[in-house]
């Protein structure tokens, strides 16, 4: 089995992983996730992109097999998706305009898009950050 199969990204029945949010509570909406608001970037059959998911099902330490590894601390939101569109939303977090394109010292960061598009398939290629958009890469 090819360990690079994007295990969650093209599931027919669409179990979509949503990264835990930090800093904002909303524990009631998100059940027992650690820190709250869930962002889901997959399309449903109706073609609606879900932003904030207020699903409180099965949020306690979900464990999902992904590409030969185990991911914990994410919340599985069960919903049917268009075949092939049940992708992981690596694009999570609250955006503040003044946080874009800045490094730790506040200097503009090279090579970063000012409006980074949502790429629901990105987790197959990048380790996702649930912390949002602020950038930390002092390149000494």
């Amino acid at each position: 089995m090819d360990v690079f199969m994007k295990g969650l990204s093209k599931a027919k029945e669409g179990v979509v992983a949503a990264a835990e949010k930090t800093k904002q509570g909303v524990a009631e909406a998100a059940g027992k996730t650690k820190e709250g608001v869930l962002y889901v970037g997959s399309k449903t059959k109706e073609g609606v992109v879900h932003g904030v998911a207020t699903v409180a099902e099965k949020t306690k330490e979900q464990v999902t097999n992904v590409g030969g590894a185990v991911v914990t601390g994410v919340t599985a939101v069960a919903q049917k998706t268009v075949e092939g569109a049940g992708s992981i939303a690596a694009a999570t977090g609250f955006i503040k305009k003044d946080q874009l394109g800045k490094n730790e010292e506040g200097a503009p960061q090279e090579g970063i898009l000012q409006d980074m598009p949502v790429d629901p398939d990105n987790e197959a290629y990048e380790m996702p950050s649930e912390e949002g958009y602020q950038d930390y890469e002092p390149e000494a």
Epitope: D2, T92, G93, E123, M127
Partner: antibody
Framework: EVQLLESGGGLVQPGGSLRLSCAAS????????MSWVRQAPGKGLEWVSA????????YYADSVKGRFTISRDNSKNTLYLQMNSLRAEDTAVYYC???????????????WGQGTTVTVSS | QAVLTQPASLSASPGASASLTCTLR?????????IYWYQQKPGSPPQYLLR?????????GSGVPSRFSGSKDASANAGILLISGLQSEDEADYYC?????????FGGGTKLTVLG
Amino acid sequence: EVQLLESGGGLVQPGGSLRLSCAASGFTFSSYAMSWVRQAPGKGLEWVSAISGSGGSTYYADSVKGRFTISRDNSKNTLYLQMNSLRAEDTAVYYCAGGARRGRIYYGMDKWGQGTTVTVSS
Amino acid sequence: QAVLTQPASLSASPGASASLTCTLRSSGDFSRYRIYWYQQKPGSPPQYLLRYKSDADKHQGSGVPSRFSGSKDASANAGILLISGLQSEDEADYYCMVWSSGAWYFGGGTKLTVLG
């Protein structure tokens, strides 16, 4: 100066447990995803586990899932690896390593510690 | 089952160039993978050299000489670490690494010998 200092290694019998620690300094610890990477004697590098900056997401290699637990205490700038049900094949030097966050992603590890040796033998 | 394949060894003369390959077996889009390269000398931890996704998205590690550069061969699904002007201190093990769907993966490593 960036420093990652691992500790907690040692000799343990098969089936036993160890807890590794990694003390970080010289960078914004909470903004880095941290990983444990190991290297068996004479072998290559093997990624073991990773944890996001807030600790909200953790990742494990198949070879250790269900036995190892990664965690972090950002108030202490410390990373941990709790290793249970240890096997002979877990014998290795264990490195603590970190990768910076940018936007929605974490980069790979660009900061590495010197490593701590774990020997599992009866 | 290796997903990142590196030749076990490579040797070259001082002053020459060495091209280290890292072949990626993947069902994903090769162009989207960011390939990391590390150097490790005996008794020392790995050191980050560089990462390469494209000419527009690459990064050289702090203090890493420009003799070290990254590229990709899309036709072979391979990442390439090019070391030009080889020096005796370049003799080391070199590892590539990528992230894919919930895990970091390392190649098996290439032992580079600088002859002479």
